[in-house]
Amino acid sequence: QNASRGRRQRRMHPNVSQGCQGGCATCSDYNGCLSCKPRLFFALERIGMKQIGVCLSSCPSGYYGTRYPDINKCTKCKADCDTCFNKNFCTKCKSGFYLHLGKCLDNCPEGLEANNHTMECVSIVHCEVSEWNPWSPCTKKGKTCGFKRGTETRVREIIQHPSAKGNLCPPTNETRKCTVQRKKCQKGERGKKGRERKRKKPNKGESKEAIPDSKSLESSKEIPEQRENKQQQKKRKVQDKQKSVSVSTVH
């Protein structure tokens, strides 16, 4: 703020002058500015034990500008307020208080919670999750063949993380047992025997066993080993109803 501390130059009557420095309209030796020129705000500035009138282009922190006809003045925000728009509308609270609808509160009202970063009362946000993605292919040790019983997994995404007082997120992963028609693995899919695992390089025509990651499991379409006859489809429907679920992720 640009401050003007006027000093008397021409007497109007005892101790008051209009011939002041800077932004003062009237001033005195003892009190500094008494009133300010248009658009400037009067404020008291403490100098040691004394308060001197000054004229400012904008009010200091903790004050707001009030305008009356030919009188502009810096007026204090409420005691719990750091910056305000007017006496009844705070825009930033002092430490230890939370801002809610222009007021500074010790505690947030019911249905709201304190955001300790912004120091505001905010709506409680509950967790939101997406619909389940399709079940992954039935696998055992990363393979989709050479077994009868395996597991399949499905996932869902967190759309909205909860706030501190919000409802926690439900599981985002589900795994259940599944069965497939027992089918021998084809040459490229065959599980390695003990002696084969010791080899550093695969034989010509063999590929290293690829264990699908979760992304490839989620995005896999039906493969030949997963085609089911009508009897197996009925079994699957029953299994869907009696999901054997193990939770692997909770937020």
Partner: antibody, heavy 119, light 107 residues
Framework: EVQLVESGPGLVKPSETLSLTCTVS????????WNWIRQPPGKGLEWIGY???????YQNPSLKSRVTISRDTSKNQFSLKLSSVTAADTAVYYC?????????????WGQGTLVTVSS | DIQMTQSPSSLSASVGDRVTITCKAS??????LSWFQQKPGKAPKTLIY???RLVDGVPSRFSGSGSGTDYTLTISSLQPEDFATYYC?????????FGQGTKVEIK
Amino acid sequence: EVQLVESGPGLVKPSETLSLTCTVSGDSITSGYWNWIRQPPGKGLEWIGYISYSGKTYQNPSLKSRVTISRDTSKNQFSLKLSSVTAADTAVYYCATYYGYGGPHFAYWGQGTLVTVSS
Amino acid sequence: DIQMTQSPSSLSASVGDRVTITCKASQDIDSYLSWFQQKPGKAPKTLIYLTNRLVDGVPSRFSGSGSGTDYTLTISSLQPEDFATYYCLHYDEFPLTFGQGTKVEIK
């Protein structure tokens, strides 16, 4: 020395308009803030409003709709009009001045004039 | 509007007594407070402004203090000419409002 003198009728009939004038000497009304204050008999003080050095006015919201403050710079006078008066407006009416927030509020007062509202 | 609550409404004291009058504002008035003395049939006279500044010519036995919402006028040693009614006035914002007054009477 700044002097303020109130003048006007001492008796006003209910529903009529009270009119008072404050004549200032020792200073110009084109500086400072020129106020009206009243005091019902045996009661406290009530601020009515002001007219500024430029002629702008501000009235107490409790009286605003009935109050008009004006000035005549050629005569160095300012005036109060209070319309639709009732017995509750019976009071000693004072004019007073101040020069801004940094100085004494109402450093100079008129002697006061009693206005009685009665039929 | 800011309300000014002055107390006591009256008090009896003797010459030489220390007298204290208080004024409580309904909200922080940031030191914008004046004290006035009024004698019967006379206009009020400003004693103190900006909480603690004595007007030229006012005896030093009058003093003012306070901050925020609570303000005090003290007469350190009451003199015969001090028997009067005292008013506080806030001028932190408009409308300006006075306290109800404190009548200081002879005991």
